[in-house]
């Protein structure tokens, strides 16, 4: 989970026509027998808001103190407000449970903007809107933060649900799905139907808006439309995954495939925005001004700065181009492509000088720590994290938004050679992972 | 040029109350973490308390917890320690400590440098 | 609690000998180690954080090694002025705790 720009995300469900909802195609024998199926009590479960991040209940201690905590696919620590703070409403009250156990061991946790420091133990937890289950899990209690809560953003804490090895202060913590899994006889495997909303929301909308799904155990059917395509997790520390080529409106970038995985790939619910090293940045930016040239837009735009605004329902969606990035698919030689549109990497923000206009952000910016796939990728898809089978799955999300001449894709096969070599081997030293920087 | 001085220590029985202060200047004191570490004459160390730099984080020996209270006043530039249930052990040279940074907790955050240290004495 | 274990206790040396001061940890401190160098009546002052980093403005003679539960600090040519106690002390869990020290002599 990357600062960078690397915080939180956005709500409201808005899926298509019914329509315009694909028709679906089974493929049975590529997944396992009871994964399958239905997890009503689990669908809506996620809320959030336009940058600020998805989020789940959860309660912790006993008697349950119930809060509203992040969800996020990269990083490994689950961590809580443990003392009062400006931006919380509430906090973990360690004193008042009677389940609290303390690690006597402090945490600190940097990531590009914003850290936080606390005091590690173990206490019961539970996700109301999610498996029946209590496990005892660690948690980091926060004391001291800095950039890191966000005013109204109605969350408390973060549910890093990467792997071990990133966790703080060290690979030692297990992280709350390893406790899960190993507790119970919840699958090792869950989902993501993040809804991004399409239009900004007032404060008001936005508290009452479902922001989308987290199906812990399984994957539920109803979230997505078409096959499930999956590409490997590369390494058990991030969600990484191995991009092999980028399209903007179907014109390949022609780089070098290492290039797009400099220094690595991740797949990211913690961060907003699609993130690019600066090279690929530059060359995407280059193609899709291009691409949307019969409109001018100032620098400070494709800079992720300045907000562009039209008038209530004009917005030009057909000038800008759909971005396409090609996965690593499970069989040698073969991938698979997801295709965004610019409904997801347009980001309406509420612009109060303007309220009769649909304004936004341009949601793909630059890192200097590789590519991010965060909530404007994720957004558009149903995204299944197989830890079980070490594989990650992309399928056309049944709330994703669009309009009445394109819509998100994920096709597949297509062929591509030496898939091997579009991987970046990071330099082995002791401070490779020290600082998780988010965007 | 960093500069920590201790004051407030005496001769107290046991059962009574200290306060300690330290006074410190030539750093922007909010943004450093600060700490109490005390020495029994021809002893070793013992880490007593120690607090972030917004007084967030704090952290207390086991020997203490209870009956010591770290605390800052940011406008005044000071850090207090304020000494209750005083017990004979308690007795030694009690030094102020500016920490790395406004953390805790964080790597490389350690303390540095130390005020000269001001004596309490618990005796009857 | 993480007991400290420095070795020797005392270490007689001659002016531009090498010193190699050993720590040792009763469980994994990973690499929240650093050593402290105290001169008689006076503040305790930082040499080495982290396990091996050097504190600014310390001399290039000293290091510091180890992670986990063995550490080492090597002062590689004595000075007069190197002549003290050095403490290691821990980070990694509460209480953090310091070790008895070793006391480096002229011999």
């Known amino acids: 989970t990357h600062l960078g720009i690397r915080l939180p995300l956005r709500s409201g469900l808005a899926g298509p026509p019914l329509g315009l909802r694909l028709p679906r195609e089974t493929d049975e024998e590529s997944e396992e027998p009871g994964r399958r199926g239905s997890f009503v009590e689990m669908v809506d479960n996620l809320r959030g808001k336009s940058g600020q991040g998805y989020y789940v209940e959860m309660t912790v201690g006993s008697p349950p103190q119930t809060l509203n905590i992040l969800v996020d696919t990269g990083s490994s620590n689950f961590a809580v407000g443990a003392a009062p703070h400006p931006f919380l409403h509430r906090y973990y009250q360690r004193q008042l449970s009677s389940t609290y156990r303390d690690l006597r061991k402090g945490v600190y946790v940097p990531y590009t903007q914003g850290k936080w420091e606390g005091e590690l133990g173990t206490d019961l937890v539970s996700i109301p809107h999610g498996p029946n289950v209590t496990v005892r899990a660690n948690i980091a209690a926060i004391t001291e933060s800095d950039k890191f809560f966000i005013n109204g953003s109605n969350w408390e804490g973060i549910l890093g649900l990467a792997y071990a090895e990133i966790a703080r202060p060290d690979d030692s913590l297990e992280p709350f799905f390893d406790s899960l899994v190993k507790q119970t006889h919840i699958p090792n495997i869950f989902s993501l139907q993040l809804c991004g909303a399409g239009f900004p929301l007032n404060q008001t909308e936005a508290l009452a808006s479902v922001g989308g799904s987290m199906i812990i155990g399984g994957i539920d059917h109803s979230l997505y439309t078409g096959r499930l395509w999956y590409t490997p997790i590369r390494r058990e520390w991030y969600y990484e995954v191995i991009i092999v080529r980028v399209e903007i409106n179907g014109q390949d970038l022609k780089m070098d495939c290492k290039e797009y995985n400099y220094d690595k790939s991740i797949v990211d619910s913690g961060t907003t925005n699609l993130r690019l090293p600066k090279k690929v940045f530059e060359a995407a930016v280059k193609s899709i001004k291009a691409a949307s040239s019969t409109e001018k837009f100032p620098d400070g735009f494709w800079l992720g700065e300045q907000l562009v605004c039209w008038q209530a329902g004009t917005t030009p969606w057909n000038i800008f181009p759909v971005i396409s990035l090609y996965l690593m698919g499970e069989v040698t030689n073969q991938s698979f492509r997801i295709t965004i549109l610019p409904q997801q990497y347009l980001r309406p923000v509420e612009d109060v000088a303007t309220s009769q206009d649909d304004c936004y952000k341009f949601a793909v910016s630059q890192s200097s720590t590789g590519t991010v796939m965060g909530a404007v990728i994720m957004e558009g898809f149903y995204v299944v994290f197989d830890r079980a089978r070490k594989r990650i799955g992309f399928a056309v999300s049944a709330c994703h938004v669009h309009d009445e001449f394109r819509t998100a894709a994920v096709e597949g096969p297509f062929v591509t050679a030496d898939m091997e070599d579009c991987g970046y081997n990071i330099p082995q030293t002791d401070e490779s992972t020290l600082m998780t920087g988010r965007a | 040029e960093v500069q920590l001085l201790e004051s407030g220590g005496g001769l107290v029985q046991p059962g009574g109350s200290l306060r300690l202060s330290c006074a410190a200047s030539g750093f922007t004191f909010s943004t450093y973490a600060m700490g109490w570490v005390r020495q029994a004459p021809g002893k070793g160390l013992e880490w007593v308390s120690a607090t972030s730099g917004s007084g967030g984080s704090t952290y207390y020996a086991d020997s203490v917890k209870g009956r010591f209270t770290i605390s800052r006043d940011n406008s005044k530039n000071t850090l207090y320690l304020q000494m209750n249930s005083l017990r004979a052990e308690d007795t030694a040279v009690y030094y102020c400590?500016?920490?790395?940074?406004?953390?805790?907790?964080?790597?490389?955050?350690?303390?540095?440098?130390w005020g000269q240290g001001t004596l309490v004495t618990v005796s009857s | 609690e993480i007991v400290l274990t420095q070795s020797p206790a005392t270490l007689s040396l001659s002016p531009g000998e090498r010193a190699t001061l050993s720590c040792r940890a009763s469980?994994?401190?990973?690499?929240?180690l650093a050593w402290y160098q105290q001169k008689p009546g006076q503040a305790p002052r930082l040499l080495i954080y982290d396990a091996s980093n050097r504190a600014t403005g310390i001399p290039a003679r000293f290091s510091g090694s180890g992670s986990g539960t063995d550490f080492t600090l090597t002062i590689s040519s004595l000075e007069p002025e190197d002549f003290a106690v050095y403490y290691c002390v821990q980070r990694s869990n509460f209480p953090w705790t310091f070790g008895g020290g070793t006391k480096v002599e002229i011999k």
């Open positions: 469980q994994s401190v990973s690499s929240y």
């Open positions: 400590a500016k920490g790395g940074s406004q953390w805790l907790y964080a790597p490389g955050s350690w303390f540095d440098p």
